[in-house]
């Protein structure tokens, strides 16, 4: 014959434990029902009556099956340098994480207690290791033959362009400037002609096209930002 199914509250057999989603009440000395997530124990069980559960009030929660007399208070609202990635509900606490451009300098069990802005690498320096959710950017000087002319928490150093003839040599914070070696076809009045370098820098996501013979004035214009060290080496 199948064993009788006991309904809560019931006295457990000596040496045995209560079933899943039940707890042993020391006062009643009975196995009693736990309350589901989002609820708490309003009235504890007795020898003759089971636990009475009630819903958590606003701004409070319980995440687990429980028999707590009061729900837990949700954490305070997220600060201006944070975003709420999980709202406060009856079943879960609010989670605040750092907004883009910031990292968690002091974490808590879930989310972040204190956010700090990601370090920006100054010209002549690039992002050696990107920032992660929990670690700051590491800046290092540009290696020989590379440069960065931006102040950025994402830009890396990129190679100097290679010129037939160098007008101004590149350095850690400036690209090389190429000069013309021989007269070329005329351009619009006032335009300054600088030929394409022998080998242009690679674009961020595409292979370098073969050098064009078309004239270019781009080297007198402000340099665009270095390709970003997008994404991050997460923990």
């Amino acid at each position: 014959l199948p064993a009788q199914v006991a309904f809560t509250p019931y006295a457990p057999e000596p040496g045995s434990t209560c079933r899943l989603r039940e707890y042993y009440d020391q006062t009643a000395q009975m196995c009693c029902s736990k309350c589901s997530p989002g609820q708490h124990a309003k009235v504890f069980c007795t020898k003759t009556s089971d636990t009475v559960c009630d819903s958590c009030e606003d701004s409070t929660y319980t995440q687990l099956w429980n028999w707590v007399p009061e729900c837990l208070s949700c954490g305070s609202r997220c600060s201006s340098d944070q975003v709420e990635t999980q709202a406060c509900t009856r079943e879960q606490n609010r989670i605040c994480t750092c907004r883009p451009g910031w990292y968690c300098a002091l974490s808590k069990q879930e989310g972040c207690r204190l956010c700090a802005p990601l370090r920006k690498c100054r010209p002549g320096f690039g992002v050696a290791r990107p920032g992660t959710e929990t670690s700051d950017v590491v800046c290092k000087p540009c290696a020989p033959g590379t440069f960065s002319n931006t102040t950025s928490s994402t830009d890396i150093c990129r190679p100097h362009q290679i010129c037939n003839v160098v007008a101004i040599p590149g350095n850690a914070s400036m690209d090389a400037v190429c000069t013309s070696t021989s007269p070329t076809r005329s351009m619009a009045p006032g335009a300054v002609h600088l030929p394409q370098p022998v080998s242009t820098r690679s674009q961020h996501t595409q292979p370098t096209p073969e050098p064009s013979t078309a004239p270019s004035t781009s080297f007198l214009l402000p340099m665009g930002p270095s390709p970003p060290a997008e994404g991050s080496t997460g923990d």
């Epitope: 690498c121 320096f125 690039g126 992002v127 050696a128 290791r129 990107p130 590491v138 800046c139 290092k140 000087p141 540009c142 290696a143 590379t146 960065s148 890396i156 150093c157 990129r158 690679s202 674009q203 961020h204 996501t205 595409q206 292979p207 390709p227 060290a229 997008e230 994404g231 991050s232 080496t233 997460g234 923990d235």
Partner: antibody, heavy 118, light 107 residues
Framework: EVQLVQSGAEVKKPGATVKISCKVS????????LHWVQQAPGKCLEWMGW????????KYGQKFQSRVTITADTSTDTAYMELSSLRSEDTAVYYC???????????WGQGTLVTVSS | DIVMTQSPATLSVSPGERATLSCKAS??????VDWYQQKPGQSPRVLIY???IRYTGIPARFSGSGSGTEFTLTISILQSEDFAVYFC?????????FGCGTKLEIK
């Protein structure tokens, strides 16, 4: 140009500890992050960890975390990698590699062969 | 951990021809992929970083492309000195991981 010169080959017994050095010349060691990479025979390259000699901050690969210690001496521009509790599968060439603001491993040492054998 | 899978394991190509090497990441790594060349008895050296930026001093015949999970290293006109092992590496998340390499050999 930065150059990385590593210490010579080592033969160790299982359970022992090895400490390899990596001397940076041409530039200050603080201009780079220094990584250590393992290349075991017939295996893929494995990243072990890095140190920022500027503030001695380290980051280790989980596989090596309990056994590896990376340090740096800025006065001699030298980084060190110590691997403890050696076992036969640690027989490998160990490389140090310098990481500048390019975000890549710009320059590598010549490698140090560590043989673990009883 | 992010797994970097390189194919083919061995590629036989004649000098002067084009070689295309593939690297696939087990999850999105953005453009955080570098390519390294290693010759027998030598240390690796960087060719391409951030998926497509040719490192300073690297010949124009080497180019990199791709983003997300699929990356390609192309050597447009193979020279005799290009026959070596090529590794890809991702630095999107820790641990930094390498592919097991493609051996480029003379056909």
């Amino acid at each position: 140009e930065v150059q990385l010169v590593q210490s010579g080959a080592e033969v160790k017994k299982p359970g022992a500890t090895v400490k390899i050095s990596c001397k940076v010349s041409g530039y200050s060691i603080t201009d780079y992050l220094l990584h250590w990479v393992q290349q075991a025979p017939g295996k893929c390259l494995e990243w072990m960890g890095w140190i920022d000699p500027e503030d001695a901050k380290t980051k280790y690969g989980q596989k090596f975390q309990s056994r590896v210690t990376i340090t740096a001496d800025t006065s001699t521009d030298t980084a060190y990698m110590e691997l403890s509790s050696l076992r036969s599968e640690d027989t490998a060439v160990y490389y140090c590699a310098a990481n500048s603001g390019t975000g890549t491993m710009d320059a590598w040492g010549q490698g140090t062969l560590v043989t673990v054998s009883s | 951990d992010i797994v970097m899978t390189q194919s083919p394991a061995t590629l036989s190509v004649s000098p002067g021809e084009r070689a295309t090497l593939s690297c696939k990441a087990s999850q999105n790594v953005g453009s955080n992929v570098d390519w390294y060349q290693q010759k027998p008895g030598q240390s690796p050296r960087v060719l391409i970083y951030k998926a497509s930026i040719r490192y300073t001093g690297i010949p124009a015949r080497f180019s990199g492309s791709g983003s997300g999970t699929e990356f390609t290293l192309t050597i447009s006109i193979l020279q005799s000195e290009d026959f070596a092992v090529y590794f890809c590496m991702q630095s999107k998340s820790y641990p930094i991981t390498f592919g097991c390499g493609t051996k480029l050999e003379i056909k």
